[in-house]
């Protein structure tokens, strides 16, 4: 469920959203940290309904839900790191 | 403009079973993910349960979930409530409620409810 | 179960007054909180999502603050038209819950 990309583009985010999202309704999170091209930070929300939305990194529901995903995932298999580029 | 419009309550007997229907319109009603919430005399909200858009996941109070069963036809746009073994406590107002999963992600559309009595 | 309480079942105020209704969960529920307003032969009517934004069309004398467990919802100036059951809701987890309501009625 929580995946981080490491990519040579620019920042994939225009808006982003601090509105609280349900984990049911959460399919995956994906993070793009900082640098390569983009200054901050990002973290996109890949909804069950198959929309998009960005969340503000400082939002604080997305921190706590990272928090437990990384811990849940930290006893059981280590967070998955994606090489990709982004065309 | 968003409606839904609640059919279905009335007067049944402890022991009976009822099914309450919410027809929507104004809305993609296979998109979004439906509840039923009540609220029983001098009462709060209480939650039953919801259901997905495709009927592949569907989540009830614990304390309820033998009892009714939820199911949806959205070729006919319509939510129902299938309520079994009911008693005096399930006689309540009876709400539908679109949960919406794109913007607010609470409930933001309900129905006009209808009431059910348990009496014999 | 995550239990919403509402410490006020029934608060009297004044047309122009500011009240604020509080609602403490019995766990984190970060903001997935809710404000919901009924009024007397009607349905409920969402005023607040996500702890502090305030639903389309909504007045903005009505506001919603707080986060974990400690959620505030506040009508700066109270109107004729406001007397109803306020309800604090979590949606952060299943199953879903309501607070037992805050009946506001004026003097």
């Known amino acids: 469920v929580l995946e981080v990309y490491y990519t040579s583009l620019r920042c994939r985010c225009v808006q982003e959203s601090s509105v609280f999202i349900p984990r049911r309704f959460i399919d995956r999170i994906q993070i793009l940290p900082r640098g390569n091209g983009c200054p901050r930070k990002e973290i996109i929300v890949w909804k069950k309904n198959k929309s998009i939305v960005c969340v503000d990194p400082q939002a604080e529901w997305i921190q706590r839900m990272m928090e437990v995903l990384r811990k849940r995932s930290s006893s059981t298999l280590p967070v998955p790191v994606f090489k990709r580029k982004i065309p | 403009e968003v409606k839904l419009l609640q059919s279905g309550g009335g007067l049944v007997q402890p022991g009976g079973s009822l099914k309450l229907s919410c027809a929507a319109s104004g809305i993609d009603f296979s998109r979004y993910w439906m509840s039923w919430v009540r609220r029983a005399p001098g009462k709060g909200l209480e939650w039953i349960g919801e259901?997905?858009?495709?009927?592949?996941?569907?989540n009830y109070a614990p304390s309820l979930k033998d009892k009714f069963i939820i199911s949806r036809d959205n070729a006919k746009n319509t939510l129902y409530l299938q309520m079994s073994k009911v008693r005096s406590e399930d006689t309540a107002l009876y709400y539908c409620a679109r949960q919406d999963d794109y913007d607010y992600y609470a409930m933001d559309y309900w129905g006009q409810g209808t009431s059910v009595t348990v009496s014999s | 179960d995550i239990v919403m309480t509402q410490s006020h079942k029934f608060m009297s105020t004044s047309v122009g007054d500011r009240v604020s209704i509080t609602c403490k969960a019995s766990q984190d529920v970060s903001t997935g909180v809710a404000w919901y307003q009924q009024k007397p032969g009607q349905s409920p009517k969402l005023l607040i999502y996500?702890?502090?934004y305030r639903y389309t069309g909504v007045p903005d004398r009505f506001t919603g603050s707080g986060s974990r467990t400690d959620f505030t919802f506040t009508i700066s100036s109270v109107q004729t038209e406001d007397p109803a059951v306020y309800y604090c809701h979590q949606y952060y987890t299943i199953p879903l819950t309501f607070g037992a309501g805050t009946e506001l009625e004026l003097k």
């Open positions: 259901i997905n858009p495709d009927s592949s996941t569907i």
């Open positions: 996500s702890a502090s």
